[in-house]
């Protein structure tokens, strides 16, 4: 019995859980979902039980290996599962637990923009990048593309301080999970500053 | 990738012995049953033995009456079938095949055949 | 010793029409039945194994269904690299594993 093996996997596509055994005369082979029986093996049987129907279209064995292969991935497929190799050469069954996290492909991130002010001919304000759907675990970065440096910055708010006749910037917020990434439009800083002197609390996408 | 080589074709007389090879590459030999498969002319196939090579247990189909030996060298990852008393009705191709993990009567590969030919 | 009977012995169909074999067993073999198509001169190749698994790599026209006795190989739009000769196998339990006589497939 090994560590816990944590696999990643995205909606719709499909994850294989990695399992070899040694053994020769196995009797079967259990596998369990958040302790409901998801699939029974007898190889020398030649038989493969299914427990619920809906999941046969899903389950496969790569290369007539005993690693499962689940495929059109929903986000309650996350969860614990487990296998058990039973074997009356084996005193006890070998076994393996795994973590699966089903992500789903992230939308285009969302910007919003806070409060701005124009003091001194630079303008002050934040830009909040989120996700309409509350995805989770969405990592943000910023982009800031000008033409002396281009910047990055960590996190969903980026501060904004613009002065007024310096060159154009672009901000562009990147979202990420364990299995996509997508970007915001790209925000002109001198577009969001004129617009933000006629509506201090405005938002866009 | 995974592969059986057998060895060439053979022609034997009646009575005579005929000892076939497969070799095994592209995989571990020694964690699937190998089986022997044979198929005369025209008909369908036969399923002979089967050894598993990690511990040399063999498995034999009854109709061969102890005719059929199946043997493997580990160091060499080949198998053997060995058949003795040859009449002409053993006039047949014959094959090797890797047994699947998870369906161990299923064959997924095949080796490339070796026709034997047994006269008078 | 298991028999399995295929039918019909042979089927003569154009491309892209729908395939159905047929094999029946004289006893229950839950569902490890097994299918391998062959053409001339080549080794078999596995289709489907426990009743309905597609091995890897085999295109999805091609489905098994059936348990107990009766079992069935279907190929949903036959292509013209699918005339061939089609077995059974059953591999329930201890051995010995044994085969149908075929179904060949050939063009209309």
């Known amino acids: 019995s090994g560590p816990v093996k944590e696999l990643v996997g995205s909606v719709g596509g499909a994850v294989t859980f990695p399992l070899k055994s040694k053994v020769k005369q196995v009797d079967s082979i259990v596998w369990t979902f958040n302790t409901t029986p998801l699939v029974t093996i007898q190889p020398e049987g030649g038989t493969i039980i299914v427990t619920q129907n809906r999941n046969r279209e899903r389950v496969d064995f790569p290369d007539g290996g005993y690693s499962l292969k689940l495929s059109k991935l929903k986000k309650n497929d996350s969860g614990i599962y487990y296998v058990g190799i039973y074997s009356s050469s084996l005193q006890q069954p070998s076994t393996q637990e795994y973590v699966l996290h089903v992500y789903e492909h992230l939308s285009k991130p969302k910007v919003t923009m806070g409060l701005q002010s124009n003091k001194n001919g630079t303008c002050v304000t934040n830009l909040t990048c989120c996700m309409e759907h509350g995805e989770e675990d969405v990592i943000y970065t910023w982009k800031a593309l000008g033409q002396a440096a281009n910047e990055s910055h960590n996190g969903s708010i980026l501060p904004i301080s613009w002065r007024w006749g310096e060159s154009d910037m672009t901000f562009i917020c990147v979202a990420r999970n364990p299995v996509s990434r997508n970007f915001s439009s790209p925000i002109l800083a001198r577009k969001l500053c004129e617009g933000a002197a006629d509506d201090p609390d405005s938002s866009m996408v | 990738q995974m592969q059986l080589v057998q060895s060439g074709a053979e022609v034997k007389k009646t009575g005579s012995s005929v000892k076939v090879s497969c070799k095994a590459s592209g995989y571990t030999f020694t964690s699937s049953w190998m089986n022997w498969v044979r198929q005369a002319p025209g008909q369908a196939l036969e399923w002979m033995g089967r050894i598993y090579p990690g511990d040399g247990d063999t498995k034999y189909n009854g109709k061969f009456k102890g005719r059929v030996t199946i043997t493997r060298d580990r160091s060499m990852s080949t198998a053997y079938m060995e058949l003795s008393s040859l009449r002409s009705e053993d006039t047949a191709m014959y094959y090797c095949a890797r047994s699947t993990m998870i369906a161990t009567g299923a064959m997924d590969y095949w080796g490339q055949g070796t026709l034997v030919t047994v006269s008078s | 010793e298991i028999v399995l009977t295929q039918s019909p012995a042979t089927l003569s169909l154009s491309p892209g029409e729908r395939a159905t074999l047929s094999c029946k067993a004289s006893q229950d073999v839950s569902t490890a039945v097994a299918w391998y198509q062959q053409k001339p001169g080549l080794a078999p190749r596995l289709l489907i194994y426990?009743?309905?698994y597609r091995y890897t790599g085999i295109p999805d026209r091609f489905s098994g269904s059936g348990s107990g006795t009766d079992f069935t190989l279907t190929i949903s739009r036959l292509e013209p690299e699918d005339f061939a000769v089609y077995y059974c196998q059953q591999h329930y339990s201890t051995p010995p594993y044994t085969f149908g006589p075929g179904t060949k497939v050939d063009i209309k």
């Open positions: 426990s009743a309905s």
